[in-house]
């Protein structure tokens, strides 16, 4: 960075609030889509180019002028695996976090024309190509349809779909948000013969109802009703089916074969939590009890003689936790070998660290192929010779990410493929492999500017730089940018990591106001090596505020001892640890302990509120955006994973003594800004409404802002700008800044 150590002598502009809100300085991505083991698609100036990975040469796959006469704004595209057709998505209408409806048309790349017959209906909820060829499965009005050819009529697979009641091939609200992180509940077999799907029944699930005010001209607000199981309420039920798409006919109804949950699940409420095809005729299903410390994997084979699916009890694999819950958020997915007779899976080892274990389908026990006081983040690819994974092993930094490969014939032969490529600039990698893992794109997202490179798996040599953000680098040379410090403190003989966004020309002999940016939910991580341009960048650069984050007990990727510390006790240690972190930061000598603030969104809003309501005396003020205020208000799947059930026999006492409302009196000692969107389908406005009521009831003066018709993201352009401007004013006022 050019300039000088002396802030007064540095005439460069700072990174302003407007820079953040208007996205003045844009990080360039390099988003590719692999279409084979050696080719990928990349969108450039709205042309779709096809690149050869080995040589880097490209040709135009589809010109931007192709759809000039289309008459619709194309939101997204998807090319069939055989490269013959392109699915065009338009009329996109967002629903929840992942779900949306849209219209679709199919363009024949050979005939260079749109297919006009037997079109997919408007308001389709999900569409997906088969993994090979060009079959299509889609969901419309909660029912599943299959197209064998894009120009042929659809075959209807299900007939039971009913809005808000029966969902075939798509998730209901809670499965979308908390289980599959997707709207889709359809899974093609590898060659597209079978289509597996889940059916969710929300008949008995209570509805959350909230007003949607819409346009000013709407005299009576609309009421939105969503089946949403809160903690302890009636949950959706699930069934699982497989249909053979080769047997579909217009004149007879499709026969879907049900695969029932294991007996150990059927004894009570349970979830379907993972579906993975092992081979063309073998599928693995993972089921999870409502009390999420016990899961079962079933491995089911197709019996051609009966047309049924058999799941042998001898092939069941049980995964359980005695200290908390199974998985980070749910049981991890298996990665099967080519023959389908064995698989690799991330599970907790004896020491409570998540590592890769090798399973044979007919054996109960598995063999760990990685070990150490670090964690495997994800399995990224599996070939006949190697398994590729991302971990945070390197230099013992939980907030780093690197790509490794392990030799399957000798587990001692492990190579870090990314660690030494650019160690100063790049410490946080993700990866995208080609279809058979012959090539991979490394995406480095920090601590330096993002860097995208292409590599060959044959010799792990770098082939070329795809994007280095050099243009942005040049622009930022003229800006007084903050620096980022990543370090740890030791509490009770345990390392706890924090990050600080430090103002330009940071001088440790000076005193700075500090804002603690908190999330602190189970398995969260806020201290990492990622480069970001965000609100904190502005606060540090322009307002000279230190923005710190701390990963205390409950945080992830450092072993279950830390993560499971808050099991059945949300609102305790993770809250206390944020307060303790602020105390530790105060002792570092460069923090003005009269000007410490805290802010957070969602779970972070809950922790912020609990911290401010603790009466610690550490914090002057804080902002809670869309906070949870009482765990009985939040959804069953997330809440019960950590808290169990709100019943006297289980954990009702702690549900009741972990509310924000019970701390209302202590808010007299702090300045509090409470913000919520009125159309938040996730953390309901109810949660802030109850905080507000409790504060009013005890005579606390506080500030509040609602965002009409905004959901949990408060992400519309105007609302996003308004909320950050409003929060900036609040923080500046709190810190007595001009």
């Amino acid at each position: 960075n050019k300039g000088t150590d002396d802030a007064t002598a540095d005439s460069r502009k700072t990174y302003t609030l407007t820079d953040y809100l208007k996205n003045t300085y844009r990080l360039k991505l390099y988003s590719l889509r692999w279409i084979s083991d050696h080719e990928y698609l990349y969108k450039q100036e709205n042309n779709i180019l096809v690149f050869n990975a080995e040589y880097g040469n490209s040709s135009v796959f589809l010109e931007n002028s192709t759809f000039d006469e289309f008459g619709h704004s194309i939101n997204d595209y998807s090319i069939s695996p055989d490269g013959q057709f392109i699915l065009l998505e338009y009329n996109y209408v967002k629903q929840w976090r992942h779900s949306y409806t849209a219209s679709y048309d199919i363009y024949d790349l050979n005939k260079r024309q749109l297919i006009t017959e037997e079109r997919i209906p408007n308001n389709t909820q999900w569409v997906t190509w088969s993994p090979v060829g060009h079959k299509l499965a889609y969901v419309w009005n909660n029912d599943i349809y299959v197209k064998i050819e894009p120009n042929l009529p659809s075959y209807r697979i299900t007939w039971t779909g009913k809005e808000d009641i029966i969902y075939n091939g798509i998730t209901d609200w809670v499965y979308e948000e908390e289980v599959f992180s997707a709207y889709s509940a359809l899974w093609w077999s590898p060659n597209g013969t079978f289509l597996a799907y889940a059916q969710f029944n929300d008949t008995e699930v209570p509805l959350i109802e909230y007003s949607f005010y819409s346009d000013e001209s709407l005299q009576y607000p609309k009421t939105v009703r969503v089946p949403y199981p809160k903690a302890g309420a009636v949950n959706p039920t699930v069934k699982f089916f497989v249909v053979n798409t080769d047997s579909l006919s217009s004149v007879t109804n499709a026969t879907s074969i049900q695969i029932t949950a294991p007996a150990s699940m059927l004894i009570g409420d349970h979830y379907l939590c993972d579906v993975t095809w092992a081979t063309q005729e073998r599928i693995s299903l993972q089921w999870l009890r409502r009390i999420q410390n016990y899961s079962v994997m079933d491995i089911c084979d197709y019996d051609e003689s009966s047309g049924r699916w058999n799941c042998l009890v001898a092939r069941q694999h049980i995964e359980m936790s005695t200290t908390g819950w199974v998985g980070r958020f749910r049981p991890s997915e298996p990665h099967f070998t080519l023959d389908g007779n064995s698989f690799y899976k991330i599970i907790s080892n004896e020491e409570g660290y998540r590592h890769i274990c090798y399973f044979q389908i007919d054996k109960k026990d598995c063999t760990f192929i990685t070990k150490g006081t670090w964690e495997v983040i994800g399995i990224e690819a599996l070939t006949s010779d190697y398994l590729y994974y991302i971990s945070n092993e390197y230099k013992g930094m939980p907030g780093g990410r690197n790509l490794y490969k392990i030799q399957l014939s000798d587990y001692t032969k492990v190579t870090c493929l990314s660690c030494e490529l650019n160690p100063e600039r790049c410490q946080y990698y993700s990866v995208s492999f080609s279809k058979e893992a012959k090539y991979y794109q490394l995406r480095c997202s920090g601590p330096g500017l993002p860097l995208y490179t292409l590599h060959s798996s044959v010799n792990d040599k770098g082939l070329r730089v795809l994007e280095d953000n050099s243009a942005l680098d040049k622009m930022l040379q003229n800006v007084q940018m903050p620096s980022k410090k990543l370090d740890f403190i030791i509490l009770n003989e345990t390392k706890f990591w924090y990050q600080m966004i430090l103002p330009p020309h940071f001088d440790k002999s000076k005193k700075y106001p500090l804002l603690l940016d908190v999330y602190a939910g189970p398995c969260s991580q806020k201290a990492d090596t990622v480069f970001r341009l965000n609100w904190a960048t502005y606060l540090a650069s322009t307002e000279n505020i230190i923005v710190a984050s701390f990963d205390g007990r409950g945080s992830g990727y450092q072993g279950d001892k830390i993560m499971h510390a808050i099991n059945r006790r949300l609102g305790t240690f993770e809250v206390e640890d944020q307060i303790e972190a602020a105390r530790q930061f105060s002792k570092m000598g460069f923090v003005d302990n009269k000007r410490i603030a805290i802010w957070g969104w969602s779970y972070g809003g809950y922790v912020t509120s609990m911290v401010l309501g603790s009466g610690s005396g550490v914090f002057k003020c804080g902002i809670a955006v869309a906070p949870v205020s009482r765990w009985e208000y939040y959804d069953s799947v997330y809440t019960e994973r950590y808290m169990g059930l709100p019943t006297p026999e289980d954990n009702l006492d702690h549900y009741r003594n972990s509310t924000v409302m019970s701390r209302a009196e202590n808010f007299k000692q702090v300045e509090y800004l409470l913000i919520h969107g009125t159309a938040d389908d996730n953390v309901h406005f109810q949660q802030s409404a109850q905080i507000s009521k409790a504060l009013v009831d005890v005579g606390v003066d506080f500030q509040a802002m609602w965002y009409t018709d905004e959901d949990h993201g408060i992400a519309s352009s105007t609302a996003h700008q308004h909320i950050y401007t409003h929060m900036s004013h609040f923080i500046k006022q709190c810190f007595s800044l001009p």
């Epitope: 017959e117 037997e118 064998i148 050819e149 120009n151 042929l152 009529p153 075959y155 053979n244 080769d246 047997s247 579909l248 006919s249 217009s250 004149v251 007879t252 026969t255 051609e304 003689s305 009966s306 047309g307």
Partner: antibody
């Protein structure tokens, strides 16, 4: 390779019973339906009925009362039984595989003559 | 039942000719129409499914078109091996029904 082979040809007595066998190979009878069609001498093709992959059956109304289609998946065979035979049942009988909404593979046909 | 009417019942054409056979349905069947070829030895093969889709392995000189009630099969360049009887068949509704056939001969 997909193949269908009909057998059971011969001369049948009027009023008697016909039982034809279709032996399938190269595909599963639990996945694909198998149809029967017949062709009287010098005439066109006439659909008789189908047995679907899941074992359900459908028949032309003209044959409903005297035709039964069944299968033995372990032997990969489909059967056509026709009772109360009459002279007009004399025909070449074909079995064929159902692929979605068309017949993609046909047997070579088997000739049945109904005569006293 | 849906009646299928085929015409002509027979036709004679020269090698290399373009030949068209038509088929009409007694009610609308959208595009649910298939064409089959029956050789003189009785062997039957699928040519076209769903009105216009060529079955794998069928020469590209065969093409199909039409929707609703009127359909046609065209052979663009007649070859000696095309001597056969051609049948249309509707697949929209049970019972499936066939046209009466068109016998194609070489002049």
């Amino acid at each position: 390779e997909v193949q269908l082979v009909e057998s059971g040809a011969g001369v049948k007595q009027p009023g008697g019973t016909l039982r034809l066998t279709c032996t399938a190979s190269g595909f599963s009878l639990t996945t694909y339906g198998v149809h029967w069609v017949r062709q009287a001498p010098g005439k066109g093709l006439e659909w008789v009925g189908v047995i679907w992959g899941d074992g359900r059956t459908d028949y032309d109304a003209a044959f409903m009362s005297r035709v039964t289609i069944s299968k033995d998946t372990s032997k990969s065979t489909v059967y056509l039984q026709m009772n109360s035979l009459r002279a007009e049942d004399t025909a070449v009988y074909y079995c064929m595989r159902n692929r979605h909404d068309w017949f993609d593979y046909w047997g070579q046909g088997t000739t049945v003559t109904v005569s006293s | 039942d849906i009646q299928m009417t085929q015409s002509p019942s027979s036709l004679s054409a020269s090698l290399g000719d373009r030949v068209t056979i038509t088929c009409s349905a007694s009610q609308g069947i959208r595009n649910s129409l298939n064409w089959y070829q029956q050789k003189p030895d009785g062997a039957v093969k699928l040519l076209i499914y769903y009105s216009s889709n060529l079955h794998s392995g069928v020469p590209s000189r065969f093409s199909g078109s039409g929707s609703g009630t009127d359909f046609s099969l065209t052979i663009s360049n007649l070859e000696p091996e095309d001597i056969a009887t051609y049948y249309c068949q509707q697949s929209i509704k049970l019972p499936f029904t066939f046209g009466s056939g068109t016998k194609l001969e070489i002049k």
